[in-house]
């Protein structure tokens, strides 16, 4: 997260760090018992390595009483996800057991309602992706506040030049943004997830190259499947 | 614990070209970013450029583009610095940097006839 | 380009002394990082983001400022801090470094 602060510990129940070999990769969102949502690209770094997730952490290296690794049972990335774009970038992880749920630890409602985003919307991002231009990487979760963008200004040719589908969204990227390493997690609008960092090679922070973001209703069905 | 392991000092004839290596260990250098930075026989310090592994994306200081290369291996989690086209005036100690964070030991380029 | 300009460029301090170097930009910047060169070593980062110390550095350091103005602290110099100290802003590509300030133990 470029431009953003420190997040009040654990008042993100829902975030989920998905780590490679015990080191965090992606970012993710429980959406339900047994369940996180993230980016389907995430799992193409995974390689051959042992993918777990976290939840109940604000630290990733500080012992927490809330903080559990669960392995992963099971990983479905969108069927129609490629690795040279970030159409259908979308990944659900079934986790090796059901979440001991708690304060620090719970299921985020997600949009079913297939209708944008209101312009200018203040939505928050979270992750522990990079903090700054020189790829530091945070031991605790940091968030932003974004205003979405229009889908039409992200696909002038000066922005994305077309490449923003009707299933993306976008968010401003004037120096706050996501970046590196937050690919997979959420974008909330009014305590509901709305959309999916995607995990892209974009620059970051840049006004002229926006956030681009998965958006989840648009994926109902899809999601619904795999959860039943 | 992360590392940062450069290769040997090199002496190099004018004209010529160097590739020198930075091989990380304690962290996988997919998720970050790496830097190198130059250092000539006391002189303060420059930003070459940094590349993101992960995708080969790279950005230079628009001074040294042309003169160095920046590339990685992320299989040997490896990051390298191509020096072109030699003179005396890149005779210095090359870094590379995880995220300007953990520094290499640095590596000594002699530029000589 | 911003350039950053460091002052002064050779200061000493005495052990206990309290000790404050400077980093001016010619234009307004964020993301001040902060570091320590000790003679013959590799650079060591001290503060990064203008304020925020370092893993492992210790607390008698501290940096502040904003906009074209910002300062690296010594609270109690110790004759271990002599060395050189180097700015670098990440605000405004290309990110220069300024060009040192040595710290000299008197």
């Known amino acids: 997260i470029l431009g953003g602060r420190e997040a009040e510990a654990h008042a993100r129940p829902y975030m989920a760090s998905v780590q490679v070999n015990g080191e965090h990769l992606c970012g993710g969102v429980l959406v339900a018992e047994q369940w996180v949502l993230s980016a389907a690209h995430c799992l193409e770094d995974a390689a051959d390595g042992k993918v777990q997730v976290l939840l109940g952490a604000h630290s990733l290296s500080q012992p927490e009483p809330s903080k559990r690794l669960y392995d992963v049972l099971r990983a479905v990335p969108h069927p129609d996800s490629r690795p040279d774009t970030i159409d259908h970038d979308l990944l659900l992880l079934q986790l090796s057991e059901k979440a001991t749920l708690g304060p620090a630890v719970r299921p985020l409602p997600w949009q079913r309602v297939d209708r944008d985003v209101e312009p200018g919307t203040l939505c928050d991002v979270a992750g522990w992706g990079i903090v700054s231009h020189a790829g530091r990487r945070p031991d605790r979760l940091q968030h932003v506040l974004l205003p979405v963008l229009d889908r039409a200004t992200c696909n002038r040719r000066t922005h994305h030049d077309g490449a923003i589908t009707q299933r993306m969204m976008c968010a401003e990227s004037n120096r706050r943004d996501s970046c590196k390493g937050d690919s997979g997690g959420p974008l909330v609008c009014g305590g509901v997830l709305e959309g999916v960092v995607t995990s892209g090679s974009r620059v970051c922070g840049n006004r002229k190259k926006p956030g681009i973001y998965t958006r989840v209703a648009s994926y109902a069905a899809w999601i619904d499947s795999v959860l039943a | 614990e992360v590392q940062l392991q450069q290769s040997g000092a090199e002496l190099v004839k004018p004209g010529a070209s160097v590739r020198l290596s930075c091989t990380a260990s304690?962290?996988?250098?997919?998720?970050?970013?790496i830097h190198w930075v130059s250092q000539r026989p006391e002189q303060g310090l420059e930003w070459i450029g940094k590349i993101d592994p992960a995708n080969g994306n790279t950005k230079y200081d628009p001074k040294f583009q042309g003169k160095a290369t920046i590339t990685a291996d992320t299989s040997s989690n490896t990051a390298y610095l191509q020096l072109s086209s030699l003179t005396s005036e890149d005779t210095a100690v090359y870094y590379c940097v995880n995220a300007m964070e953990y520094w290499g030991q640095g590596t000594s380029v002699t530029v000589s006839s | 380009q911003s350039v950053l300009t460091q002052s002064p460029a050779i200061m000493s301090a005495s052990p206990g002394e309290k000790v404050t170097m400077t980093c001016s930009a010619n234009?307004?910047?964020?993301?001040m990082y902060w570091f320590q060169q000790r003679p013959g070593s590799s650079p060591r980062l001290l503060i990064y983001?203008?304020?925020n110390l370092a893993s492992g550095v210790p607390v008698r350091f501290s940096g502040s400022g904003s906009g074209t103005s910002y300062s690296l602290t010594i609270s109690r110099m110790e004759a271990e801090d002599a060395a050189t100290y180097y700015c670098q802003q990440w605000s405004t590509y290309p990110w220069t470094f300024g060009g040192g300030t040595k710290l000299e133990i008197k």
């Open positions: 983001d203008t304020s």
């Open positions: 304690g962290f996988n250098i997919k998720h970050t970013y």
């Open positions: 234009s307004s910047v964020s993301d």
